[in-house]
Interface confidence: low
């Protein structure tokens, strides 16, 4: 048993048919000694007495709020929540494993930039009864610090029959410093509780492999005189950090027809600026990433040929 | 060439081979992105790489004031890579061809590293680890650990002499 | 010419809370970093913990997690500590240290070292 | 926590001799991360050396820094009447940032 925050415990149980559980001593906060009852959640019906309360913790109906009382004035509560362990793995009921870019992935995690500020998300079915609370640093063994915010519900989407909630948190590395090389990676840690269900995920990375730039922006096609090619330019992102001669973005331009079996054409550049071929119907893209380190490309921006 | 207190690089010339740099560590190893090498505990491996610190210069204010900081780190970054990739971890089995991307990498890091140090002056370069790893597959992951560093330390690297280059250039 | 301005000296009883203030005045309080560092009489100096003004963001020495709260109100350019559970030996001088951040295109870095000390307040806890 | 452990704790000098003074930490700290500060009594601490070895702004050329790893020296070439006092090493490499317990330089 250990303590998740004040008054909040959380009982670590190996989750097979018949497992003996845990026993666990709750001890009432109160310098009273005598005439001291225990109760569990809105029960009346009175558990124990006495200043400690010894009792085995095997399942869900033997966690809760733990209230003891003294002529009808409550003293102290301690929530006893389940965290389960089956065959030797933690329970991952909470959370949807979203599969990408390896399976046993719950939480994915982006950055706009090298500020050192990055959003981390994760997908749930659960719609009531759940909270989450973030942690996050910059090691593990001597930790630096890194502040996250609240996680809040960001988007709800309907799968097949089920409803999918999408949480998602922002955290800034404390001391960042964009242009040196990281050596020890963001850490991640996500406490999830469902009722009286306790989970904990974690992820870990160095901001350089999560960086996805925003799509370029202001793209502006200027047709060529006596010619089907047209210039297309383009600007960085806002968001994308500066100095752009320090922190420099590679571009991919594409030229796609309207039918998605037509052959795309491609060109990469380092200029913010390209000659193309516009075909009758196409769209021209861009997209955008970092020029020294292949992490994700951006979304890509798109204006029509005609 | 970077002369210690004194003159500044080719940056144009060395731009360029840092940039190449970068694209042929990403094509020794491109698939590094789906693997997480830290799930294998590579803090004995590779915790003794040269990295490029918040303190050492490297950033474009930290370059304007005086690049000779920085120059110094990444020229000790190079001769370690170039070191490594020249030892029995990528010499070794299981062997690389010849005109292998790694030996191309070998082949840039020890230009770069002589673009930035003229003959006869020598900048204090780090130790490399011994690390002779027994088995072929600790070798393999050994060098996935290695270069994956390395594509991050040649991305730093690159940054500095593209800033440099637009804005340090005579 | 950048300053940073202490409150008054502080006589506390064991177990209440001090509140000690810190303000910049003449520079940019954002593009700092603000660490409280503490001196008992004829000691060393202690590191408490710091607050990047900016963000808000602050980090404590484990030695202080819980008893310390270090904050920033960016509009007046001035940052607080607040010391709560106090004993006779945090019976002490409470000094300020910026530390900057190396700034370019809107991000930043920290140069870690304490370039501009406040004058510094003394604490005194006794019963 | 790095522990640094400064010596001598006193160096009794006549102005115009030489000083060193020794930092040892307990684990290696990054030069970049390593910083001397200069204190007078009933003074705030004076920035003298950032990154081992800079001088900071308005600091006299006789005060030098040095070393790495886990040694490091602040040596000042010739004492000057208003250099005795206490001074202290700190590291930023690791939190919780740490200072040595200093070193008391007093006129002999």
């Known amino acids: 048993i250990w303590e998740l925050k004040k008054d909040v415990y959380v009982v670590e149980l190996d989750w097979y048919p018949d497992a003996p559980g845990e026993m666990v001593v709750l001890t009432c906060d109160t310098p009273e000694e005598d005439g001291i009852t225990w109760t569990l959640d809105q029960s009346s019906e009175v558990l124990g007495s006495g200043k400690t309360l010894t009792i085995q913790v095997k399942e869900f109906g033997d966690a809760g709020q733990y209230t003891c009382h003294k002529g009808g004035e409550v003293l102290s509560h301690s929530l006893l929540l389940l965290h389960k362990k089956e065959d030797g793995i933690w329970s991952t009921d909470i959370l949807k494993d979203q599969k990408e870019p390896k399976n046993k992935t719950f939480l994915r995690c982006e950055a706009k930039n090298y500020s050192g500020r990055f959003t981390c998300w994760w997908l749930t079915t659960i719609s009531t009864d759940l909270t989450f609370s973030v942690k996050s640093s910059r090691g593990s063994s001597d930790p630096q610090g890194v502040t996250c915010g609240a996680a809040t519900l960001s988007a709800e989407r309907v799968r097949g029959d089920n409803k999918e909630y999408e949480y998602s948190v922002e955290c800034q590395e404390d001391s960042a410093c964009p242009a040196a090389e990281e050596s020890l990676p963001i850490e991640v840690m996500v406490d999830a509780v469902h009722k009286l269900k306790y989970e904990n995920y974690t992820s870990s990375f160095f901001i350089r492999d999560i960086i996805k730039p925003d799509p370029p922006k202001n793209l502006q096609l200027k047709p060529l005189k006596n010619s089907r090619q047209v210039e297309v330019s383009w600007e960085y992102p806002d968001t994308w950090s500066t100095p752009h001669s320090y922190f420099s973005l590679t571009f991919c331009v594409q030229v796609q027809g309207k039918s998605k079996r037509e052959k795309k054409d491609r060109v990469f550049t380092d200029k913010t600026s390209a000659t193309v071929i516009c075909r009758k119907n196409a769209s021209i893209s861009v997209r955008a990433q970092d020029r020294y380190y292949s992490s994700s490309w951006s979304e890509w921006a798109s204006v029509p040929c005609s | 060439r970077a002369v210690p207190g004194g003159s500044s690089p080719a940056w144009t010339q060395c731009q360029q081979l840092s940039q190449k740099l970068c694209t042929l560590a990403w094509s020794a190893h491109p698939l590094v992105g789906h693997m997480d090498l830290r799930e294998e505990g590579d803090e004995e491996t590779t915790n003794d790489v040269p990295h490029i610190q918040c303190g050492d210069g490297c950033d474009p204010q930290g370059l304007r004031d005086n690049s000779q900081f920085c120059l110094q780190r990444i020229h000790q970054g190079l001769i370690f890579y170039e070191k490594l990739l020249g030892s029995d971890i990528f010499t070794g089995e299981p062997s690389l061809l010849p005109d292998s991307p790694v030996a191309q990498l070998h082949a840039s890091l020890l230009g770069l590293s002589q673009l930035l140090q003229p003959e006869g002056h020598h900048w204090e370069t780090q130790q490399i680890p011994s690390l002779s790893p027994s088995q072929p597959w600790q070798r393999l992951l050994l060098r996935f650990k290695i270069l994956r560093s390395l594509q991050a330390f040649v991305a730093v690297a690159a940054r500095v002499f593209a800033h440099g280059a637009a804005t340090l250039s005579p | 010419q950048v300053q940073l301005v202490q409150s008054g000296a502080e006589v506390k009883k064991p177990g209440s809370s001090v509140k000690v203030s810190c303000k910049a005045s003449g520079g940019t309080f954002s593009s700092n970093y603000i660490s409280w560092v503490r001196q008992a009489p004829g000691q060393g100096l202690e590191w408490m913990g710091l607050?990047?003004?900016?963000?808000?963001?602050?980090y404590y020495a484990q030695k202080f997690q819980g008893r310390v709260t270090i904050t920033a109100d960016e509009s007046t350019s001035t940052a607080y500590m607040e010391l709560s559970s106090l004993r006779s030996e945090d019976t002490a001088v409470y000094y300020c240290?910026?530390?900057?951040?190396?700034?370019?295109?809107?991000?930043?870095?920290?140069?870690?070292?304490?370039?501009?000390w406040g004058q510094g307040t003394l604490v005194t806890v006794s019963s | 926590d790095i522990v640094l452990t400064q010596s001598p704790a006193t160096l009794s000098l006549s102005p115009g001799e030489r000083a060193t003074l020794s930092c040892r930490a307990s684990q290696s700290v990054s030069s970049n991360y390593l910083a001397w500060y200069q204190q007078k009594p009933g003074q705030a601490p004076r920035l003298l050396i950032y990154y081992a070895s800079r001088r900071a702004t308005g600091v006299p050329a006789r005060f030098s820094g040095s070393g790495s790893g886990t040694d490091f020296t602040l040596t000042i070439s010739s004492l000057e009447p208003e250099d005795f006092a206490t001074y202290y090493c700190?590291?930023?490499?690791?939190?919780?940032?740490?200072f040595g317990q200093g070193t008391k330089v007093e006129i002999k």
């Open positions: 240290a910026r530390s900057k951040k190396g700034m370019y295109g809107g991000w930043t870095y920290p140069l870690m070292m304490f370039d501009l």
């Open positions: 700190q590291q930023t490499s690791n939190t919780p940032f740490t």
């Open positions: 607050i990047d003004p900016n963000f808000g963001g602050a």
